[in-house]
């Protein structure tokens, strides 16, 4: 492989590490759009044990601009020294490097969820993976926000054990024939900025208490 003098410095790539469906996903964007690589290779090492850069197997010669690092990056303490190489054919166009600390740099994407409206309550079904590694729990708590007529109420359901499998939460004591919107997100213990899901809305049907109790059965 020929190595042309890189057109970009470390400043030429923007990286983002996210916890998406409890998977550690590193994504990147190029600031200079004039040169488009045909493929990328991602390498890393750990600062506390500086060894040769290791190629991430599922992110070698990849055409995607993201990489799943769940099985590679486990420690929230370590610095992961990351190098992204961009290629056009056999020519290296650029190399960007960046250090990541999961405890600081990880952003937490909201889980997938569905809502079903009944007369006076809403069932919120939150979808978590069936198994979530302990290291990927990150002291997170689930927040469900209910909005109606400009009023926002926060629900913090207590989840026994860790966040895995599907979870259902009932928002009750609602007013029939009223529009409610729901958003879910993951909140970190140190109250860092959260990423809220788009709102999902439902107009509750009109009806009696007894009907809603029947429909919930």
């Amino acid at each position: 492989i020929s190595y042309d003098s890189p057109d970009y410095t470390d400043e030429s790539c923007t990286f983002k590490i996210s916890l998406r469906n409890f998977r550690s996903i590193l994504s990147w964007e190029l600031k200079n759009h004039s040169i488009v690589p045909t493929h990328y290779t991602l390498l890393y090492t750990i600062m506390s044990k500086p060894e040769d850069l290791k190629v991430v197997k599922n992110c070698a010669n990849t055409t995607r601009s993201f990489c799943d690092l769940t099985d590679e990056w486990r420690s929230t303490h370590e610095a992961y020294v990351t190098v992204l190489e961009g290629f056009s054919g056999n020519t290296t166009l650029f190399s960007c490097s960046h250090n990541f600390w999961l405890a600081i740099d990880m952003s937490f994407e909201p889980p997938e969820f569905e809502i079903v409206g009944f007369t006076n309550h809403i069932n919120v079904m939150v979808k978590f993976p069936s198994i979530v590694e302990e290291e990927l729990q990150f002291d997170l708590s689930l927040v469900i926000e209910e909005q109606s007529e400009g009023i926002v109420k926060k629900h913090k359901p207590e989840i026994k054990g860790n966040m895995s499998g599907n979870f259902t939460y009932i928002i009750d004591k609602l007013i029939p024939n009223t529009n409610y919107c729901v958003s879910v997100y993951l909140e970190h213990s140190d109250e860092q900025a959260v990423i809220k899901s788009p709102l999902k809305c439902t107009l509750l049907p009109p009806g009696q208490e007894s009907e809603s109790a029947e429909s919930a059965k």
Epitope: S48, A79, N99, I104, E134
Partner: antibody, heavy 118, light 112 residues
Framework: QVQLQQSGVELVRPGTSVKVSCKAS????????IEWVKQRPGQGLDWIGM????????KCNKKFKGKVTLTADKSSSTAYMHLSSLTSDDSAVYFC???????????WGQGTSVTVSS | DVLMTQTPLTLSVTIGQPASISCKSS???????????LNWLLQRPGQSPKRLIY???KLDSGVPDRFTGSGSGTDFTLKISRVEAEDLGVYYC?????????FGGGTKLELK
């Protein structure tokens, strides 16, 4: 050799704000975290927060939420801690420290004394 | 937050004699990555802190081998085999396993 040079003594009025700087030299600034620690006179140490100068990502102790803003300038290899709405409780020596992994703090600055007094 | 308790508060020693400081945490400091993030630092009078020991027992470069760190789980100890004048000051243990990191209250090592 690794050095963290902090800004000088600050004597400020209650209700105002102050910005403490920490200039790093002798290593690659964006390869390490900068952490901040508070020490009140005659007392122990209290961790404030940390910043990844490469990404600008920060993590702070809840105790200091709304009080402290951490930033870093890569071009000058300098980290900053901005303290707002100062009260006498903020009178302390503030240290910056370098970390290769979270909470490692292997090198420390000389400290910046902040006194809040009317 | 994890509470770090150091004993004794003050330790009066004679130069050349051994010294021992205890540090106990309110929770285990063994992280899910298998490491124990327990460190020790020394703050000499009028100076900034200096890290001596990290990951329970690893000595920082330039730290004399008369210092040893040991322990696991919630109980940790810093020992000085023969105290020298330059060792005087306040010793702090701190944990970095759990957020936020927390410090012990300090142990002042002084001359008898």
């Amino acid at each position: 050799q690794v050095q963290l040079q902090q800004s000088g003594v600050e004597l400020v009025r209650p209700g105002t704000s102050v910005k403490v700087s920490c200039k790093a030299s002798g290593y690659a600034f964006t390869n390490y975290l900068i952490e901040w620690v508070k020490q009140r006179p005659g007392q122990g140490l209290d961790w404030i927060g940390m910043i990844n100068p490469g990404s600008g990502g920060t993590k702070c102790n809840k105790k200091f939420k709304g009080k402290v803003t951490l930033t870093a300038d890569k071009s000058s290899s300098t980290a900053y801690m901005h303290l707002s709405s100062l009260t006498s409780d903020d009178s302390a020596v503030y240290f910056c420290a370098r970390s290769g992994w979270v909470y490692a703090m292997d090198y420390w600055g000389q400290g910046t004394s902040v006194t809040v007094s009317s | 937050d994890v509470l770090m308790t150091q004993t004794p508060l003050t330790l009066s020693v004679t130069i050349g004699q051994p010294a021992s400081i205890s540090c106990k945490s309110s929770q285990s400091l063994l992280d899910s990555d298998g490491k124990t993030y327990l460190n020790w630092l020394l703050q000499r009078p009028g100076q900034s802190p200096k890290r001596l020991i990290y990951l329970v027992s690893k000595l920082d470069s330039g730290v004399p081998d008369r210092f040893t760190g040991s322990g696991s789980g919630t109980d940790f100890t810093l020992k000085i085999s023969r105290v020298e004048a330059e060792d005087l000051g306040v010793y702090y243990c701190w944990q970095g396993t759990h957020f936020p990191q927390t410090f012990g209250g300090g142990t002042k090592l002084e001359l008898k």
